[in-house]
Structure formats: structure tokens, C-alpha cells
């Protein structure tokens, strides 16, 4: 898979492959995988990809199911890259406060908050 | 501050306090704090709260600015709790795939993806 494929296209294709291979993936009825209990997905990327790893090790490889796991591995690579960018730029306090304000604003309006 | 205050109310109050104390917080003109370079805030919570720690250590405490940092510490506590909930429940593959599909769907529609 060329890593040059835009990440947005990669995600779309992965969603389609996930749908296609669902029957094969759920064949193991005794397997249990940790599932986050809330919808703030970005907080749980580590656990999600650990789960994908567990699933991959239990799935017969070959054909396009292999492509599914390759895609998921590229998505992980993208997210790891984004995480690296969390601390790259050192800026003045004012700019940090603008980012913090935006973060809290998004938390206020978009997060699913259970008290 | 009672920890029983709903997190959503806590975030709103913190936004107001941030605005109130901005002048005091930016007084240190030479301080530099890492600022994430993308809008996927949830991926960067660790770095954001490290930055808050740096800022707190450089800010003269007292009055309601103390309340601001207490609030931010409670928000961190809430987020840490959410992170713990990422791997608490072990579920069948089918349920994991539903979560994965939702995660990729949200990534597809809501994340700010730069190729």
C-alpha cells in the first residue's frame, strides 16, 4: 500500500473493508477485547489499536483482510505522528492560553461528558 | 472546590476564569510552553496538562487564580478517569468492531486530517 494515499481516503477504504470482512472477523466467538465505555475516542487510541492487534493475531490472514490490517496499521502510524506533534512547537504563554481556551471550548461543546 | 460540581459546569467556569486572569498569566514574557500544532485536542491532553503545570509553577498564586488551577486539576482528574475507562470492559469481537467502526466514522467526519 503506498503510504502516499491521503489519510482521509485511507479511513474511508478501511471502513468499507471492515464491513466486507465482518463475518470473518467475528468467527472467534470466545475472544474478548477491551472496548472503551465512552465516546471520546481520541482518548482511547492506544487501547483501540491494542485491540486491533489482538484481533489480527486471531484472524486467518490472506486476501483483502490483510489489506484491512495494513490500513489500520497506517492509520495508527498517522495518529502516532499526530501525537508527536503535540509538543513540537514551544510558544509564548499567550498562544498556549489560546490553545487551552480552544481545547476547553471544544470540551464544553463537543465532548460527551458524563458527570 | 467540591468535586461534585458537574464537569460541564467546571469547564464553563474554568473558561471564564481563564479569561479573567489572562493578563496575570501572560506576565512572564520569556516563558515558552509546547503548543500542539493540530486541533485533535484529545490526542494531546498529556502535553496540555504538562503546559498547565509549567504555567502554574511560574504564576503567583492567590485568590481566584488559585481556583483556576484547582479547576484545571479537576478537569485533568476527569480526563484521567476517562482514559482509565478505555480498557475496562472486555467485550465480544462484534462489539469491538462496532466501536472501531464508530471511531473510524468519527475520524472520517470530525477529525481535522492533514495528509
Amino acid at each position: 500500500i503506498p503510504t502516499e494515499i491521503p489519510t482521509s481516503a485511507l479511513v474511508k477504504e478501511t471502513l468499507a473493508l471492515l464491513s466486507t470482512h465482518r463475518t470473518l472477523l467475528i468467527a472467534n466467538e470466545t475472544l474478548r477485547i477491551p472496548v472503551p465505555v465512552h465516546k471520546n475516542h481520541q482518548l482511547c487510541t492506544e487501547e483501540i489499536f491494542q485491540g486491533i492487534g489482538t484481533l489480527e493475531s486471531q484472524t486467518v490472514q490472506g486476501g483483502t483482510v490483510e489489506r484491512l490490517f495494513k490500513n489500520l496499521s497506517l492509520i495508527k502510524k498517522y495518529i502516532d505522528g499526530q501525537k508527536k506533534k503535540c509538543g513540537e512547537e514551544r510558544r509564548r504563554v499567550n498562544q498556549f492560553l489560546d490553545y487551552l481556551q480552544e481545547f476547553l471550548g471544544v470540551m464544553n461543546t463537543e465532548w460527551i461528558i458524563e458527570s | 472546590i467540591p468535586t461534585e460540581i458537574p464537569t460541564s459546569a467546571l469547564v464553563k467556569e474554568t473558561l471564564a476564569l481563564l479569561s479573567t486572569h489572562r493578563t496575570l498569566l501572560i506576565a512572564n514574557e520569556t516563558l515558552r510552553i509546547p503548543v500542539p500544532v493540530h486541533k485533535n485536542h484529545q490526542l494531546c491532553t498529556e502535553e496540555i496538562f504538562q503546559g498547565i503545570g509549567t504555567l502554574e509553577s511560574q504564576t503567583v498564586q492567590g485568590g481566584t487564580v488559585e481556583r483556576l488551577f484547582k479547576n484545571l486539576s479537576l478537569i485533568k482528574k476527569y480526563i484521567d478517569g476517562q482514559k482509565k475507562k478505555c480498557g475496562e470492559e472486555r467485550r465480544r469481537v462484534n462489539q469491538f468492531l462496532d466501536y472501531l467502526q464508530e471511531f473510524l466514522g468519527v475520524m472520517n467526519t470530525e477529525w481535522i486530517i492533514e495528509s
Epitope: Q95, E102 | R22, I26, E29, T30, H38, K39
Partner: antibody, heavy 117, light 109 residues
Framework: QVQLQESGPGLVKPSQTLSLTCTVS??????????WSWIRQHPGKGLEWIGY???????YYNPSLKSRVTISVDTSKNQFSLKLSSVTAADTAVYYC?????????WGQGTLVTVSS | SYVLTQPPSVSVAPGQTARITCGGN??????VYWYQQKPGQAPVLVVH???DRPSGIPERFSGSNSGNTATLTISRVEVGDEADYSC???????????FGGGTKLTVLG
């Protein structure tokens, strides 16, 4: 490498509104590490900071121009814009857009705007 | 608001050292940035955070800052250094950018 390009009319009539757009390429305007700024330079004079904006919409303006200036951002187009109202001949200048981290990192090439009837 | 004062012009012979000053109240407590601007071109950063050089800027360019004066020093001046030089600081309350009036460096000869 981030590149910035100013666009807009080179001639504006007195009392009208000057409107310029800056298109950012080679980087995202949603980059949390940057503000997006406008600076101008009157003929033969020094640089004058007009204002800047964060991707979230937070704006900061030069107090001497604040009453006439509006800076906005369009993250979907990777652009930010300047509007300066009630212009006079004193607003004739080269207008630059620039990315602003701890300093002005990247600049547009500048566009001359003349205010004349 | 905060004011930065620069001499309008400085002249120097090739090979000599040019010093361009930037005055401001207690400027030593701020970070100072210096830009070089040649005719018809956009400014280019030559010194940031008082004395640090961006990559690609010759070692001949250096800066210092203390008390009420920041100084840009260009040693072994070359004809190609002829340009306008502007200092810049942040005025933190509220977060505004301030430029000096600019200094025209003329290389004699």
C-alpha cells in the same frame, strides 16, 4: 515550506473598505503553533503591525487601528482576510500577510494598495 | 503602548562592524527579534530571542539585549548587507506586536 500569497484590489477609493485575502499553502492554517498576521509598510517608512488571528478565531489588533480593522479566518479554504474600513490616503501602503509563531516566520511578497479617488 | 526607538540610518565601510540599536523601556526583560529588509522584498528574520540566529543566517550577525537597549551587530560588513533593519518585541499586556521605526544600513564605498 509554508507559503503565503496576498490577493485583493490594488486601488481603493477613500471612505471605502480595503479587503485583502491571504492564501496559505504548504501548511495548515489550523496549525496551533501559529497566528496569522497582517503588517503594512507605508512608502519609505517602517513596518506597522495591523493585527493577527488564531485558527480558533481569537483576534488581536493594533490599538491605533482597532476601530477600523477586522481579521477573519476560513480554515476550510486555508485563508485569512483583512478588512480596513473608512480608508484615507494615509492607508496607502504595501500590505503583507505573515505567519507568526514566536516571531514572523513566513511572509507573503506584499501587495501595494493605493487609496485614491 | 510600548515604543521602540531606532536610529534612522547607520553608515559603515565594508569589512567594518555595524551596530544598530533599538531602545525601549526595560527592553532587557523582553525577547527582541531583528528583521532585514531589502528593497522590494519582504522582511527576513536575522536574529530571534535577543541573540539566536536562524539557520542560513551568517555568524556575522549577532544580537545582545540588556537594560533599555538591544543591539544588532553585523561584523565584517559586506555590500550585500545594505538593507533596512527593524527590531520587534511583544508587548504582553495585551499581546501586541511592536516594531521599531527601522534603520537604513548604508555600506560606504
Amino acid at each position: 515550506q509554508v507559503q503565503l500569497q496576498e490577493s485583493g484590489p490594488g486601488l481603493v477609493k477613500p471612505s471605502q473598505t480595503l479587503s485583502l485575502t491571504c492564501t496559505v499553502s504548504g501548511g495548515s492554517i489550523s496549525n496551533g503553533g501559529y497566528y496569522w498576521s497582517w503588517i503594512r509598510q507605508h512608502p519609505g517608512k517602517g513596518l506597522e503591525w495591523i493585527g493577527y488571528i488564531y485558527y480558533s478565531g481569537s483576534t488581536y489588533y493594533n490599538p491605533s487601528l482597532k476601530s477600523r480593522v477586522t481579521i477573519s479566518v476560513d480554515t476550510s479554504k486555508n485563508q485569512f482576510s483583512l478588512k480596513l474600513s473608512s480608508v484615507t490616503a494615509a492607508d496607502t501602503a504595501v500590505y503583507y500577510c505573515a505567519s507568526l509563531g514566536n516571531w514572523f516566520d513566513y511572509w507573503g511578497q506584499g501587495t501595494l494598495v493605493t487609496v485614491s479617488s | 503602548s510600548y515604543v521602540l526607538t531606532q536610529p534612522p540610518s547607520v553608515s559603515v565601510a565594508p569589512g567594518q562592524t555595524a551596530r544598530i540599536t533599538c531602545g525601549g523601556n526595560n527592553i532587557g526583560s523582553k525577547n527582541v527579534y531583528w528583521y532585514q529588509q531589502k528593497p522590494g522584498q519582504a522582511p527576513v528574520l536575522v536574529v530571534h530571542d535577543d541573540s539566536d540566529r536562524p539557520s542560513g543566517i551568517p555568524e556575522r550577525f549577532s544580537g545582545s539585549n540588556s537594560g533599555n537597549t538591544a543591539t544588532l551587530t553585523i561584523s565584517r560588513v559586506e555590500v550585500g548587507d545594505e538593507a533596512d533593519y527593524s527590531c520587534q518585541v511583544w508587548d504582553s499586556s495585551p499581546d501586541h506586536v511592536v516594531f521599531g521605526g527601522g534603520t537604513k544600513l548604508t555600506v560606504l564605498g
